[in-house]
């Protein structure tokens, strides 16, 4: 029985040319996490974090993706095309697969600065 839940950073926005951290956290389960896969909206893999072997960043993203912090992922040099859904897929034993969703909106610099100015602290 799958008892775990995934908490994510939810809907986030970031500035074009900037960077953003994608974070997921699996809780409420004793299952062993064997692998965490990070996927983009078009279902292409960005990175794999294996519990014993560490990180594998996919060749197409090596320039713009940095591992961490933790099991999270940092996207750098953001473009407007990076807007969309991102998924963290936790492969666990014996539970199976848990999946979290994050929506990233990449904003033009001026828009991002404007919206940040009016955020509630």
């Amino acid at each position: 029985m799958m008892t775990g839940t995934i908490e994510t950073t939810g809907n986030i926005s970031a500035k074009k040319g900037g960077s953003v951290i994608l974070q997921c956290h699996l809780s409420s389960t004793m299952a062993q996490v064997t692998q965490v896969n990070w996927e983009q909206h078009d279902h292409s893999l960005l990175a794999i974090r294996n519990a014993e072997l560490g990180w594998h960043i996919y060749p197409a993203f090596k320039d713009r993706v940095a591992p961490g912090p933790g099991l999270g992922l940092t996207l750098q040099s953001l473009t407007m095309n990076d807007t969309g859904e991102y998924f963290c897929t936790y492969h666990t034993y014996p539970d199976g697969t848990y999946r979290g969703r994050i929506f990233l909106e990449v904003l033009e610099s001026s828009v991002a600065e404007h919206s940040a100015r009016f955020q509630i602290p």
């Epitope: 064997t34 896969n37 893999l45 294996n50 014993e52 072997l53 990180w55 594998h56 996919y58 034993y93």
Partner: antibody, heavy 120, light 107 residues
Framework: EVQLQESGPGLVKPSETLSLTCAVS????????WNWIRQPPGKKLEYIGY???????YYNPSLKSRVTISRDTSKNQFSLKLSSVTAADTAVYYC??????????????WGQGTTVTVSS | DIVMTQTPLSLSVTPGQPASISCKAS??????VAWYQQKPGQSPQLMIY???YRYTGVPDRFSGSGSGTDFTLKISRVEAEDVGVYYC?????????FGGGTKVEIK
Amino acid sequence: EVQLQESGPGLVKPSETLSLTCAVSGYSITSDSWNWIRQPPGKKLEYIGYISYSGNTYYNPSLKSRVTISRDTSKNQFSLKLSSVTAADTAVYYCARLDFSNYGGAVDYWGQGTTVTVSS
Amino acid sequence: DIVMTQTPLSLSVTPGQPASISCKASQNVRTAVAWYQQKPGQSPQLMIYSASYRYTGVPDRFSGSGSGTDFTLKISRVEAEDVGVYYCQQYYTTPWTFGGGTKVEIK
């Protein structure tokens, strides 16, 4: 260049423990991942498990209760023990290296393989 | 476990002609797929990783493509030295699993 060489008995009796060793040259086993993969006659290649650069292990759940992978860093070798063997464990056993950082789960160096037959 | 199914089981190709091997995953594995070549009497050798990236030293007549559940290994012009068995493998989730192999022969 990385070289791997399997060694161990070619014949094991049912219910006994299969023991194989892989000697690695040209590379330190304290880097990357060191794997055991087997192929029973006429069947698919099957992942048995691996030991990581740090000494952590992963075992295929289908074999987990019977498998132990260990290493001896002073000799630069790693070993496989498979207990309570049956005829179904008859296979060619390969040791292999995996550079996860660069190639993910793709195995980039393989030993020549050693045939193990389980029979009384 | 994810099941990788290869077709055809065997392939007989005239030298200089193209060859294509298919691999189907039982569930979506994105692009976490590798291809290996096993020549007669030898151990498997890595050819392709991440579905479409050629490993060091692999001739450019070999190419990999696909994502999701359907993957293909193509040889643009088969040469005599290409005979052997070709295997696909997924590493999207553990346990990592292999296809049953496709035997390539020369006509």
